[in-house]
Structure formats: C-alpha cells, structure tokens
C-alpha cells in the first residue's frame, strides 16, 4: 500500500522538516526559516509560535517541531499551552485587581499564584489545632482533645458541636 500511495502521491515521501513544493514539481523542499512540519507528506510548513513580550522561549522552533514558550521570571502561565502570563505574588498573598495583597486573617496561600484559601476547620473532623495557621501555611490538625486524655478509648468520638467563632459548613 505504501508503494502504491507514493506512486499516486509523490508528496507522501516528503519527511518531517520539509514540504511538498507544488511550484517545483512536487519535490520536497526544506521548511523556510521560522516554520516547521512535524509530520511527513505536508504541502505547507506551519509558522512557528513566537515568544514575545512577557513570554520567553522554553524550546526553540526547529524544522520539525514548534517553539514552546513560558513566562519570564516573576510570572506564571495561564490557559492552554501557556497562552497568557500572570504576575507572581509572594506566599501569603493573592493577586487582586489592585495588585498583590496579603491574605486576610483565617486564610492562607502557600504558592506564588492562586487565591487565599480558608484554614482547615479541625473541629469538623473532631480534631484540635496542633499548629496555628499563618498567611503562608494552613493549620495542622492533631488528635481530638478526648484522644489525648488518659484512659481515652481508641474509638474516635463524634465531632463536637461547633466551636465558637466557626460557622457551620
């Protein structure tokens, strides 16, 4: 079948990195600069993606593969294929329309991107706070107070009624 196909279509012999040039008797011509063909038998080469402005080149375009972009330092990718860049913030902050803002009390963000999230409510799992939360870190929940009392059974007690200051979830 391959032989039959190549007799019918000389373009099928053109490898990746070339295109079948109709203007030159269908011979295989190399892709021009800033273009590529990732598969054989192509009648045109595709233009390479350009990494400009806030983007930087992660992988150069070659005759057989497209360029890949990421964001310059201080920024991170958003969207499919890093289609947009967004400013980083510090841990303990989130990006708002007014820029990077510290997380409100009771919330944290342990990354340079994304939003501040509420601390875990340990009491909902019948546990107590072992390590307090900060703007950068979630609380660490420990065993429930009942588990720590001498002679406590190993059966986990039911979750207590909600603690003051916590609304039911």
């Amino acid at each position: 079948f391959e032989r039959t196909r190549s007799l019918q279509d000389p373009c099928s012999n053109c490898p990746a990195g070339t295109f079948c040039d109709n203007n030159r008797n269908q011979i295989c011509s190399p892709c021009p600069p800033n273009s590529f063909s990732s598969a054989g038998g192509q009648r045109t080469c595709d233009i390479c993606r350009q990494c400009k402005g806030v983007f930087r080149t992660r992988k150069e375009c070659s005759s057989t593969s497209n360029a890949e972009c990421d964001c310059t330092p201080g920024f991170h990718c958003l969207g499919a294929g890093c289609s947009m860049c967004e400013q980083d913030c510090k841990q303990g902050q989130e990006l708002t329309k007014k820029g990077c803002k510290d997380c409100c009390f009771g919330t944290f963000n342990d990354q340079k991107r994304g939003i501040c999230r509420p601390w875990t409510n340990c009491s909902l799992d019948g546990k107590s706070v072992l390590v307090n939360g900060t703007k950068e870190r979630d609380v660490v929940c420990g065993p429930s107070p009942a588990d720590l009392s001498p002679g406590a059974s190993s059966v986990t007690p039911p979750a207590p009624a909600r603690e003051p200051g916590h609304s039911p979830q």
């Epitope: 350009q50 289609s83 947009m84």
Partner: antibody, heavy 116, light 107 residues
C-alpha cells in the same frame, strides 16, 4: 487597579505627524508589552506594533514600518506612539493595550483626524 | 501574516437566544486565540483567552472552544448587555491579527 490613560483627540494635516501618549496609572507596566491597535471609523481592529517598556524594544507591523515609532519614559510610566507622513486613511481611534498573551487592559482611545 | 475570518459578519438575535460565532485562521494557531467584545464608542474588552479560558469577571454564559484553525464563541443565553461587536484575535505569531468582527444586534 492599573489603568491606561491616553492623551486627547488630535486633528492633523496630511503629511504631518502625531504623537499619542499612554500612561499607566495605579501601577506600572511591569514586564508586559504595550501594543498599539487602531480602528478606522466603522472598521475593525488593526495591530500596529508593540513595545516592552522595561527593555525599550519595539516591534512594528510591516505595514507601518518606517512611519511609526514607539518609545517609553519609565520615570513616568508612559509609552508613546509617533506616526508620521499622515494621510486621510490614518483617521482612526488609536488604542494602547497591555499585552500578556491577550490584550486585557485597554486605554480609552485617542481619536486622530487627518484632514486638510 | 495569519488571516482571521469570522462568520457571520452580523446576526440578529433575541434575549435568551443561544448565539454562536465562528473564527477561522489561515494556518494552525493551536489554542492561541482570544475573543473580545466591543460596544460603540468604547474600547474592546477581553472575554476569552487561550481559546477556552474565561477572563476574570466575565459571565459564565460566555464560552470558547476550538483548536488548530477553527474556533467558536458561544453565548448560552443572550442578555440585553451582550448586544455588541465581537472580535477574535490570534496571539500565535506577529503581526497579531484580528477577525473582521461580528455584530450582534436585536432581532
């Protein structure tokens, strides 16, 4: 919140030049490019070129090469677009826009009228 | 330059209608396609980036899809404030280019 504030409307004679400014208020340009996009009356959007303010490097669409110059003043967080040899077809609203892979913040636009 | 072609050029629709606008690139642009809304006398507003990601603050009735050369903007239930002109734009290779626009007006 970062806003892009442009200079006011201009009326120019054919053959003259116009310089439109775009100032970042409430923030800085950061590492983003600032593009200039124009829109003739009743027409679509046309990209003219861009500049990365922190580097001062400009890149122009071929159609405007030789007629357009984009510059910046980092001390005032302002970019400028200078278009020379004006003709009637250059009558348009000129927008600056922050480019981070998409134009997410736009200036209010500057109407440039070219008329003898 | 990569040519962007939108269809239709204009359409008439009623509040509550589902509206679909298409955009075709003259060569593959992967998912580097943005959609904007423009109202008379105003600057364009970014709706969708990366073909399908909703820009912050944009209502969820707007959605985008597609990859390669064919893309779609869908408004699931048209609202009075959605009557405007919509543009696609490729951010794959300079010069960045826009479609000619699709005007959505009241039936």
């Amino acid at each position: 919140e970062v806003q892009l504030v442009q200079s006011g409307a201009e009326v120019k004679k054919p053959g003259s030049s116009v310089k439109v400014s775009c100032k970042a208020s409430g923030g800085t340009f950061s590492s983003y490019a600032i593009s200039w996009v124009r829109q003739a009356p009743g027409q679509g959007l046309e990209w003219m070129g861009d500049i990365v303010p922190i580097f001062g490097v400009a890149n122009y669409a071929q159609k405007f090469q030789g007629r357009v110059t984009m510059t910046r003043d980092t001390s005032t967080s302002t970019v400028y677009m200078d278009l020379s040899s004006l003709r009637s077809e250059d009558t348009a609203v000129y927008y600056c826009a922050r480019d981070r892979g998409a134009f997410d913040i736009w200036g209010q636009g500057t109407m440039v009228t070219v008329s003898s | 330059a990569i040519r962007m072609t939108q269809s239709p050029s204009s359409l008439s629709a009623s509040v509550g209608d589902r509206v679909t606008i298409t955009c075709r690139a003259s060569q593959t642009i992967s998912s580097y396609l943005n959609w904007y809304q423009q109202k008379p006398g105003k600057a364009p507003k970014l709706l969708i980036y990366g073909a399908s990601s909703l820009q912050s603050g944009v209502p969820s009735r707007f959605s985008g899809s597609g990859s390669g050369t064919d893309f779609t903007l869908t408004i699931s239930s048209l609202q009075p404030e959605d009557f405007a002109t919509y543009y696609c734009q490729q951010s794959y290779s300079t010069p960045w280019t826009f479609g000619q626009g699709t005007k959505v007006d009241i039936k």
